[in-house]
């Protein structure tokens, strides 16, 4: 068990703070909830503190919750590949470029670390080149979320990882908006981190609304499990 992994044996409170600017539309989001890495479970509620969110909530899911991949459930035989927990409590910087097909892009930078007993994800997001009447600024996405695989590989040069995946957003007309994600994680501290073999995270997300919440918001339930590395040969012959 890495030193950081010991911090995730129980339920951990989570705070998310985002400042965004998409095509000049500025906004802020705050979120709170908890994570339980034993089950790879996240429960979070987000509110837009600046009024109505100028982009669809589903376009921010990866920035919020795929931001705290330290809550992914890594099976026993894969724990030595869990970079995310090994970087804690000092945390990691997570940078992404998200290309929305035939539309604009988001660039995000986040610091994910413990502040006291709380896991905090502080994010800056800049979006450019979006069409005002496109799927994103035109709010044409359905309020739901598909399951995805998130592919992880070591980046030994930077003592971190590189992550690639493609998100499929459902559009109201029945078509799909693709969002290509290119992600890089580097540790904040100078302690040792686990550099993984290639593997993936399997994610399942459910979006809902709180009927009593007056502010523009999103309620998120997510389960994330690491996979893609088989037991070693010695395990097979036990």
């Amino acid at each position: 068990m890495s030193k950081g992994e010991e911090l995730f044996t129980g339920v951990v409170p989570i705070l998310v703070e985002l400042d965004g600017d998409v095509n000049g539309h500025k906004f802020s989001v705050s979120g709170e909830g908890e994570g339980d890495a034993t089950y790879g479970k996240l429960t979070l509620k987000f509110i837009c503190t600046t009024g109505k969110l100028p982009v669809p909530w589903p376009t921010l899911v990866t920035t919020f919750s795929y931001g705290v991949q330290c809550f992914s459930r890594y099976p026993d035989h894969m724990k030595q590949h869990d970079f995310f927990k090994s970087a804690m409590p000092e945390g990691y910087v997570q940078e992404r470029t998200i290309f929305f097909k035939d539309d604009g892009n988001y660039k995000t930078r986040a610091e994910v670390k413990f502040e006291g007993d709380t896991l905090v994800n502080r994010i800056e997001l800049k979006g450019i080149d979006f069409k005002e009447d496109g799927n994103i600024l035109g709010h044409k996405l359905e309020y739901n979320y598909n399951s995805h695989n998130v592919y992880i590989m070591a980046d030994k040069q930077k003592n971190g990882i590189k992550v690639n995946f493609k998100i499929r957003h459902n559009i109201e007309d029945g078509s799909v908006q693709l969002a290509d994600h290119y992600q890089q994680n580097t540790p904040i501290g100078d302690g040792p981190v686990l550099l993984p073999d290639n593997h993936y995270l399997s994610t399942q997300s459910a979006l809902s609304k709180d009927p009593n919440e007056k502010r523009d918001h999103m309620v998120l339930l997510e389960f994330v499990t690491a996979a893609g590395i088989t037991h070693g040969m010695d395990e097979l012959y036990k």
Partner: nanobody
């Protein structure tokens, strides 16, 4: 554990003003977002106004926007609701509430700690 005690309620004429307070004891006050809710006889308990742990984010129900002002003094562990231009429909028991977390939500279910309430009659 947080204990909340409201004060300042009373009888006031329509168009008048009133300030209700909520004193908290227990853990670090700034760790909690706070809210005011009200309940008229035979009605649901409704969100009135809320304030984040730092005090930097506030939100009001449409029915009180521009008339009520929420504030907090973290040094004194106290939250206030200044109510101006009061109307008969503001008559209710006003409850102070706190949630474990600094983010301001408006849903009743997000609030874990509640005061006993103070009556405001217009």
């Amino acid at each position: 554990q947080v204990q909340l005690v409201e004060s300042g309620g009373g009888l006031v004429q329509a168009g008048g003003s009133l300030r209700v307070s909520c004193a908290a004891s227990g853990r670090t006050y700034s760790d909690y977002a706070m809210g005011w809710f009200r309940q008229a006889p035979g009605k649901e308990r409704d969100f009135v106004a809320g304030i984040s742990g730092s005090g930097g984010d506030t939100y009001y129900a449409d029915s009180v926007k521009g008339r009520f002002t929420i504030s907090r003094d973290n040094a004194k562990n106290t939250m206030y609701l200044q109510m101006n231009s009061l109307k008969p429909e503001d008559t209710a028991v006003y409850f102070c509430a706190a949630r474990t977390g600094t983010v301001l939500f408006t849903s009743r279910v997000d609030y874990r700690y509640w005061g006993q309430g103070t009556q405001v009659t217009v």
